[in-house]
Interface confidence: low
């Protein structure tokens, strides 16, 4: 017996209760490929999630994070609270980076300053909570009148944040 389900296009499911007739996916469900025997429930963008793209009969909803949060994981499976540059997110909220570490983004953890001496170089610009140190030439290379580099302008990461 030929499997008639293979003829059912995306946006439908093969309804065994109706002699393998292709039935449209019910509201709030979708099938992104043909030949499906069921439709998948649409993702709900609730709480810290905001709808980026509505669910259709052939594709799942896509979520963003509300202002003050950023996406984590494949297809924005999680929203993590933003912190300021110079901070990291802990279980108790945003905390300033400890001395000797920095974070130049609104996400992620504080990372140690670069150890210039490991590469035989000297510290040209001191690090801060928001910025890594800038390594310069080795102490032996430094001569009077040598010009010093200026630190880069602060990076900005407001992220997608519709108000």
């Amino acid at each position: 017996l030929q499997d008639l389900c293979s003829n059912c296009p995306a946006g439908t499911f093969c309804d065994n209760n109706r002699s393998q007739i292709c039935s449209p996916c019910p509201p709030n469900s979708f099938s992104s490929a043909g030949g499906q025997r069921t439709c998948d429930i649409c993702r709900q963008c609730k709480g810290v999630f905001k709808t980026r793209k509505e669910c259709s009969s052939t594709s799942n909803a896509e979520c963003d994070c509300i202002s003050g949060y950023h996406c984590l994981g494949a297809e924005c499976s999680m929203c993590e609270q933003d912190c300021k540059q110079g901070q990291e997110l802990t279980k108790k909220g945003c905390k300033d980076c400890c001395f000797g570490t920095f974070n130049d983004q609104k996400r992620g953890i504080c990372r140690p300053w670069t150890n210039c001496s490991l590469d035989g170089k000297s510290v040209l610009v001191n690090g801060t909570k928001e910025r890594d140190v800038v390594c310069g030439p080795s102490p032996a290379d430094l001569s009077p009148g040598a010009s010093s580099a200026t630190p880069p302008a602060p990076a900005r990461e407001p992220g997608h944040s519709p108000q």
């Epitope: 793209k53 994981g73 900005r156 108000q163």
Partner: antibody, heavy 121, light 111 residues
Framework: QVQLQQPESELVRPGGSVKLSCKAS????????MDWVKQRHGQGLEWIGN????????NYAEKFKSKATLTVDTSSSTAYMHLSSLTSEDSAVYYC??????????????WGQGTLVTVSA | DIVLTQSPASLPVSLGQRATISCRAS??????????MHWYQQKPGQPPKLLIK???NLESGVPARFSGSGSGTDFTLNIHPVEEEDTATYYC?????????FGGGTKLEIE
């Protein structure tokens, strides 16, 4: 299919302003971010900013915050970019471009043909 | 802002040969799941066209002679074998954070 229609050109006097349009069709206008990109003659691409039509939320590159204002008219599925205090540095092709979605970060999939803005007395 | 440095600025290639374009980001644009780096082709008088998304995913309709690789800060666009119609300027672009930025472009010319 997705289409983004832009006027071919605009001639503006120095110190003046211009409102560029981008009419979208072939998709649900409110569901996708719309971005604007600048390209001076023979130069590279510069991202200006973007707008989410559903909420009117915007993001701008720092250097364009006082130059460009992004708006939308959802009833006509049209995105606009208003450029003010124009100088010769603003003479360029301006593209509107629609984003796709994946995990909160997006690529620029569909592009308009661009509007050539000429600032000249 | 994340700075994208493309090299070379100009790339002469013979027909049928391999073209390799590099794009280096001033910070990582990758997670364990994805690299938020994309490649575009632009021909004179035309808007850019998306070729590769998320470092290595070929956009629909783009010939298989285009491929992308890389993660973290270093990314590569390869074209092999190069054809006449590939004469264009190629740009990398990140979507890791706002503002998005583009590389300076690489002009591919057929020798």
């Amino acid at each position: 299919q997705v289409q983004l229609q832009q006027p071919e050109s605009e001639l503006v006097r120095p110190g003046g302003s211009v409102k560029l349009s981008c009419k979208a069709s072939g998709y649900t206008f409110t569901s996708y971010w719309m971005d604007w990109v600048k390209q001076r003659h023979g130069q590279g691409l510069e991202w200006i900013g973007n707008i989410y039509p559903d909420s009117g939320g915007t993001n701008y590159a720092e250097k364009f915050k006082s130059k460009a204002t992004l708006t939308v008219d959802t009833s006509s599925s049209t995105a606009y970019m208003h450029l003010s205090s124009l100088t010769s540095e603003d003479s360029a092709v301006y593209y509107c471009t629609r984003e796709e979605a994946l995990g909160g970060y997006y690529e620029l999939t569909y592009w308009g043909q661009g509007t050539l803005v000429t600032v000249s007395a | 802002d994340i700075v994208l440095t493309q090299s070379p600025a100009s790339l002469p290639v013979s027909l049928g040969q391999r073209a390799t374009i590099s794009c280096r980001a001033s910070q990582s644009v990758s997670t364990s799941s994805y690299s938020y780096m994309h490649w575009y082709q632009q021909k004179p008088g035309q808007p850019p066209k998306l070729l590769i998304k998320y470092a290595s995913n070929l956009e629909s309709g783009v010939p298989a002679r285009f491929s992308g690789s890389g993660s973290g800060t270093d990314f590569t666009l390869n074209i092999h074998p190069v054809e006449e119609e590939d004469t264009a300027t190629y740009y990398c672009q990140h979507s890791w954070e706002i503002p998005y930025t583009f590389g300076g472009g690489t002009k591919l010319e057929i020798e």
